[in-house]
């Protein structure tokens, strides 16, 4: 039975060109994580797995960066940033556990972090 | 360079206890996971354990899970794998392996040491 | 544990040929697939990671691509020395599974 549940920095927002961190934690289970995957929409952009470390998609590296702790670092934010992030906790034996996050990349320097909030 | 050399394969009756040394060298060995592959004769490959860079971290699979244990000494730049309870479907070639750096694949292999569980 | 089902699990080719091989994954894997040759006795060599990226000193006949669930490595003019078994890898998910192999024979 899954009784994990995974906190996310939930809806934020940051500036154009500026940098985010996307953070997740998941708490109420006992079980082993031993891979966390960072996914945007339908890509794939970073793996940190438990004992063989951090892992960049190419097509990320130069925008991204592992840390801090199990979070993901995004820089050089652009419009095209804004959207759906999901991290991915790879767990035994309870399975799987997503958390989510929206980022919206803002023009103007009035962006504000949204609260966090829970998701089962 | 980057060196494995494994050691420490033989033949074992089932129910049977071998440890497997993988001595690294070429490389800050302390500063990377590490992880054992094996291979079964004529057979794909499968990995069956992996420990982080201070040995504070490990995973299995469930076909090895409660049976294997991978350990590492960073003062002796040495990767172990102790196998208890083995069973004929363990006999294969056992690699240490090592990511490349930045690289999502297996750069580094030593040249395996053959286990074969048989009465 | 996600499986990658390799094909076909062998083929026959001559010097020159173009040679493709496929792996399918149970689940979508999002690129996290390598690929490895390896010669009989020997240990396996890694050759593509991230899907589509050339490991350091591969040769450039060598090219990965693919997304979702469907993978394919591709030989563009086969060596004499490309004669070999080939695994496919995921890194999604935990295990990190390979698919069973495609052995490249000479025709």
């Known amino acids: 039975m899954m009784t994990g549940t995974i906190e996310t920095t939930g809806n934020i927002s940051a500036e154009k060109g500026g940098s985010i961190i996307l953070q997740c934690h998941l708490s109420s289970t006992t079980a082993q994580v031993t891979q966390v995957n960072w996914e945007q929409q339908d890509q794939l952009l970073a793996i940190c797995n438990a004992d063989l470390g951090w892992h960049i998609s190419p097509s990320f590296k130069d925008r991204v960066a592992p840390g801090p702790g199990l979070g993901l670092t995004l820089q050089s934010l652009t419009v095209n940033d804004t959207g759906e992030y999901f991290c991915i906790y790879h767990t035994y034996p309870d399975g799987t556990y997503t958390g989510r996050i929206f980022l919206e990349v803002l023009e103007s320097s009035v962006a504000e972090h949204g609260a966090r909030f829970q998701i089962p | 360079e980057v060196q494995l050399v494994e050691s420490g394969g033989g033949l074992v009756q089932p129910g049977g206890s071998l440890r497997l040394s993988c001595a690294a060298s070429g490389f800050t060995f302390s500063s990377y996971g590490m992880s054992w592959v094996r291979q079964a004769p004529g057979k794909g490959l499968e990995l069956v354990a992996t420990i982080n860079s201070n040995g504070g971290s490990t995973y299995y699979p469930d076909s090895v899970k409660g049976r294997f244990t991978i350990s590492r000494d960073n003062s002796k730049n040495t990767l172990y794998l102790q196998m208890n309870s083995l069973r004929a479907e363990d006999t294969a070639v056992y690699y240490c392996?090592?990511?490349?750096?930045?690289?999502?694949?297996?750069?580094?292999w030593g040249q395996g040491t053959l286990v074969t569980v048989s009465s | 544990d996600i499986q990658m089902t390799q094909s076909p699990s062998s083929l026959s080719a001559s010097v020159g040929d173009r040679v493709t091989i496929t792996c399918k994954a149970s689940q979508d894997v999002k690129t996290a697939v390598s690929w490895y040759q390896q010669k009989p006795g020997k240990a396996p060599k890694l050759l593509i990671y991230?899907?589509?990226t050339r490991h350091t000193g591969v040769p450039s006949r060598f090219s990965g691509s693919g997304s979702g669930t469907d993978y394919t490595l591709t030989i563009s003019s086969l060596q004499p020395e490309d004669f070999a078994t080939y695994y496919c890898q995921q890194h999604y998910s935990t295990p990190w599974t390979f698919g069973g192999g495609t052995k490249v024979e000479i025709k």
């Open positions: 991230w899907a589509s």
């Open positions: 392996a090592r990511l490349g750096t930045g690289t999502l694949g297996f750069a580094y």
